[in-house]
Amino acid sequence: QFLKEGQLAAGTCEIVTLDRDSSQPRRTIARQTVKCSCFPGQIAGTTRARPACVDARIIKTKQWCDMLPCLEGEGCDLLINRSGWTCTQPGGRIKTTTVS
């Protein structure tokens, strides 16, 4: 299968870097734009702290930890109201990701 320039292989994702509009007020929550080309039944998500195509049912049910979003060796927990997840590093530092 031949891909045109800029085309993504099915089932893969890439981080798209965009120039920020400096006229917009600064927002403090880190955001990242991702472009994915997923198979049917899949949707853009996060696996091992990288963008990935994941089962759409995970997103629908908000069972975020099922997509294995944290690095190997880290613990995953759902936030209250399933608004996102936390990754707990072996040393105890906790990283939070909220889904908007």
Partner: antibody
Framework: QEQLVESGGRLVTPGTTLTLTCTVS????????VSWVRQAPGKGLEWIGY??????PHYASWAKGRFTISKTSSTTVDLKMTSLTTEDTATYFC?????????WGPGTLVTVSS | ELDLTQTPSSVSAAVGGTVTINCQAS????????LAWYQQKPGQPPKLLIY???TLASGVSSRFKGSGSGTQFTLTISDVQCDDAATYYC?????????????FGGGTELEIL
């Protein structure tokens, strides 16, 4: 809008115990950790410690024993400092610590002088 | 001893020029990429520019670029503007179980000519 504001900084004498308070708004301490950082006049940034959203604190090796970080309410994190010396004179900042420290409070000045 | 060494300690640049600031850690940062860069102006708290070594924080100009992995990191400021005059700090995250969770570099003062 996520915000942090430090309070409690003042002029104290050596040996004093002082508690600073970081009050947050626009985000939940049950979801995010907070770090305390200080900056002596004309000097660089120095990390003091961090408290995770599960109340678990971690400290810089030099700060262990004399500094205590605790969550005192759903919107406040305290930094308790004991046996203060002139070397502790600095602006003390709190910051949400997640993917980088962001945002930061404006800081509160602690002056230790006899 | 956990240490972040920033070089140079001060640098001058003309408007429109390019500046490179280096940060070397005494041990690898967590996940080899958990390093952030901050800009601080007098009388103000630091402002997050870059996190995860190369990810631009929201609202930050794309003139700021972070790179590196493990123990060696670089902040590059291109098309330098007068407003970029400030002190820049790197901050590394480390496993809290083996060392201090965080450490800052000594800072680099940028003067605009």
């Amino acid at each position: 809008q996520e915000q942090l504001v430090e309070s409690g900084g003042r002029l104290v004498t050596p040996g004093t115990t002082l508690t600073l308070t970081c009050t947050v708004s626009g985000f939940s301490l049950s979801s995010y950790g907070v770090s305390w950082v200080r900056q002596a006049p004309g000097k660089g940034l120095e990390w003091i410690g961090y408290i995770a959203n599960n109340y678990n604190p971690h400290y810089a090796s030099w700060a262990k024993g004399r500094f205590t970080i605790s969550k005192t309410s759903s919107t406040t994190v305290d930094l308790k400092m004991t046996s203060l010396t002139t070397e502790d004179t600095a602006t003390y900042f709190c910051a949400r610590d997640n993917y980088g420290m962001d945002p930061w409070g404006p800081g509160t000045l602690v002056t230790v002088s006899s | 001893e956990l240490d972040l060494t920033q070089t140079p300690s001060s640098v001058s640049a003309a408007v429109g020029g390019t500046v490179t600031i280096n940060c070397q850690a005494s041990q690898s940062v967590y996940n080899n990429k958990n390093l952030a860069w901050y800009q601080q102006k007098p009388g103000q708290p630091p402002k997050l520019l870059i996190y995860a070594a190369s990810t631009l924080a929201s609202g930050v100009s794309s003139r700021f670029k972070g790179s590196g992995s493990g123990t060696q990191f670089t902040l590059t400021i291109s098309d330098v503007q007068c407003d970029d005059a400030a002190t820049y700090y790197c901050q590394g995250e480390f496993s809290c179980s083996s060392a201090d969770c965080n450490a800052f570099g000594g800072g680099t003062e940028l003067e605009i000519l």
